[in-house]
């Protein structure tokens, strides 16, 4: 969690002199409670906005907006504490609006906003606006909180932000997977414009289960510049296991900006449709089936063969 690095942070508006300060998230009024405290914020709204840094990088930011209630407690309002909590890491960042003049009632409802908290793709935040001073321990709460889920890098506007581009969001491999005869899969995808290697991860599952029955990893060497944006075709040989028919193909790039943490793309091949009419049962059923040669599922030593070529 951090603040966007550019421009002086402003909270002043006509009729109010105000300054934005860093905050420890522990306002002095918690330690030294006051008798008279303002009411809570009204209509807290959080939206996804985008902002450029001085260096020209584009980041997603939380745009926080709220209004004041139209009661006499605004006479005791000395400012606001804005707090953003990242749910998964419990990291919290706060800023304080410090009012340098007293608020007066005027015709329009007072409205405040702040758009400088940089947020991460796919993360969830709790945004709280606390009016200051904070209430005495048994007083009515004078804060409002809302959750804010940031879209991940698949989202159209997010794709072009610096953090998403760094993880390879602009690459669209347009994966196609087709089943061939003799237990083979043909995987085709578009290479990106970087001389970096790729990995194809094949995981196969039984029809209705989530436990894999076959795994295979295939390495694709870095393409030459003339192969950028071309299709790469790979044929993967599957393990001949009856019922191991649902295949997930995942392509992992290793771009220089994200290394082994780049966005992956995947495609799935479903099991073939089961016939409506059941197969006839023979008159004679054996009491046991002949033992098959192998019962291990995992592909530890690259038993699945494969070959590939780049297609121009």
């Amino acid at each position: 969690l951090r603040l966007l690095d550019h421009r002086a942070l402003v909270c002043s508006q006509p009729g109010l002199n105000c300054t934005v300060k860093n905050s420890t998230c522990l306002d002095d009024s918690w330690i030294h409670p006051r008798n008279l405290t303002p009411s809570s914020p009204k209509d807290l709204q959080i939206q996804l906005h985008f902002a450029h840094t001085q260096q020209g990088d584009l980041f997603p930011v939380a745009h926080i907006e709220w209004t004041l209630q139209t009661d006499a407690s605004i006479l005791y309002l000395e400012g606001a504490e804005l707090s953003v909590l990242q749910l998964n890491t419990n990291e919290r960042l706060c800023v304080k609006f410090q009012f340098l003049s007293m608020l007066q009632h005027h015709r329009k409802r007072w409205r405040f906003s702040f758009s400088h908290f940089v947020v991460d793709p796919g993360q969830e935040y709790e945004v709280t606006v606390h009016h200051l001073p904070k209430p005495i321990p048994d007083g009515d709460p004078n804060h409002q909180s809302k959750n804010f889920l940031v879209p991940d890098c698949e989202h159209a506007r997010m794709k072009v932000t610096t953090p998403c581009m760094s993880s390879g969001s602009l690459w669209d491999p347009n994966i196609t997977v087709e089943t061939l005869e003799a237990h083979q899969l043909r995987v085709s995808f578009t290479l990106w414009n970087e001389s970096t290697h790729y990995q194809i991860l094949l995981t196969s599952f039984p029809h209705m289960e989530n436990h894999s029955c076959f795994e295979h990893m295939h390495h694709i060497p870095a393409p030459r510049p003339e192969e950028f944006h071309q299709r790469s075709n790979v044929t993967l040989t599957l393990r001949n296991l009856k019922g191991c028919c649902r295949h997930q193909v995942q392509i992992q790039p290793f771009f220089s900006s994200c290394l082994n943490d780049c966005l992956r793309h995947s495609a799935t091949v479903s099991c073939p449709e089961m016939p409506d009419t059941p197969e006839p049962i023979p008159d004679y059923m054996p009491l046991w089936e002949p033992r098959s040669g192998s019962s291990d599922y995992k592909d530890d030593d690259d038993k699945g063969s494969s070959h590939h070529h780049h297609h121009h």
Epitope: C25, L26, L85, L87, N88, T89, N90, E91, R92, G122, Q123, E124, E126, T128, H143, S145, K146, N147, D261, C262, L263, R264
Partner: antibody, heavy 118, light 107 residues
């Protein structure tokens, strides 16, 4: 000393209800999200639920969704788990756990045992 | 939802051995991964967070590495007090799923 103490466990029949509590001390409870994690006898850890510091974000594991309700009272430094429509598979030791700033859970209670059996 | 797998499910090693446990996420989780140690009859203890950051008070023989989908917990020199079950947990976003665990004991 930072401490979490769970209570409210016990034996209950399938379909019954229990309310677990977790009393926090030694830290600013209202600044932290809080979790419930459980562990069935002889099994691994299973994350159950999380509630954010101001209760505006709540998530549950699929296995308890619609049956369990997490809540908190910051004024009382307490975390709760209301468990309804209990099943045999809910039998476990239930831990409350505080997340560490940066990730993971660094403070755990000793756990309270819930037994669901007819 | 993202699945977490751990291997091996159990291992036996001698005192002083280097022990490696792997954890794999079915989709990328960046470095949002924690490792825990749980001794029999005790609550879990955080060893490593952010995939590779050692929790304060944890012996330096423990280390973590990895990013994306593949992660490793290494005990550089196994000690008798390290007999426990080790769990990984992803926390990129809810649900914050644990791996099935790896039981470590002494030969």
């Amino acid at each position: 000393e930072v401490q979490l103490v769970e209570s409210g466990g016990g034996s209950v029949q399938p379909g019954g209800s229990l309310r677990l509590s977790c009393a926090a001390s030694g830290f600013t409870f209202s600044s932290y999200s809080m979790n419930w994690v459980r562990q069935a006898p002889g099994k691994g850890l299973e994350w159950v639920s999380i509630i954010s510091s101001r209760s505006s974000i709540i998530h549950y594991a699929d296995s308890v969704k619609g049956r369990f309700t997490i809540s908190r009272d910051n004024a009382k430094n307490s975390l709760y788990l209301q468990m309804n429509s209990l099943r045999d598979e809910d039998t476990a030791v239930y831990y409350c756990a505080r997340p560490k700033v940066g990730g993971g859970m660094d403070v755990w209670g000793q756990g309270t045992t819930v037994t669901v059996s007819s | 939802d993202i699945q977490m797998t751990q291997s091996p499910s159990s291992l036996s090693a001698s005192v002083g051995d280097r022990v490696t446990i792997t954890c794999r996420a079915s989709q990328g989780i960046s470095n949002y991964l924690a490792w825990y140690q749980q001794k029999p009859g005790k609550f879990p203890e955080l060893l490593i967070y952010a995939a590779s950051t050692l929790q304060s008070g944890v012996p330096s023989r423990f280390s973590g590495s990895g990013s994306g989908t593949d992660f490793t917990l290494t005990i550089s020199s196994l000690q008798p007090e390290d007999v426990a079950t080790y769990y990984c947990q992803k926390y990129n976003r809810a649900p914050f799923t644990f791996g099935p665990g790896t039981k470590v004991d002494i030969k």
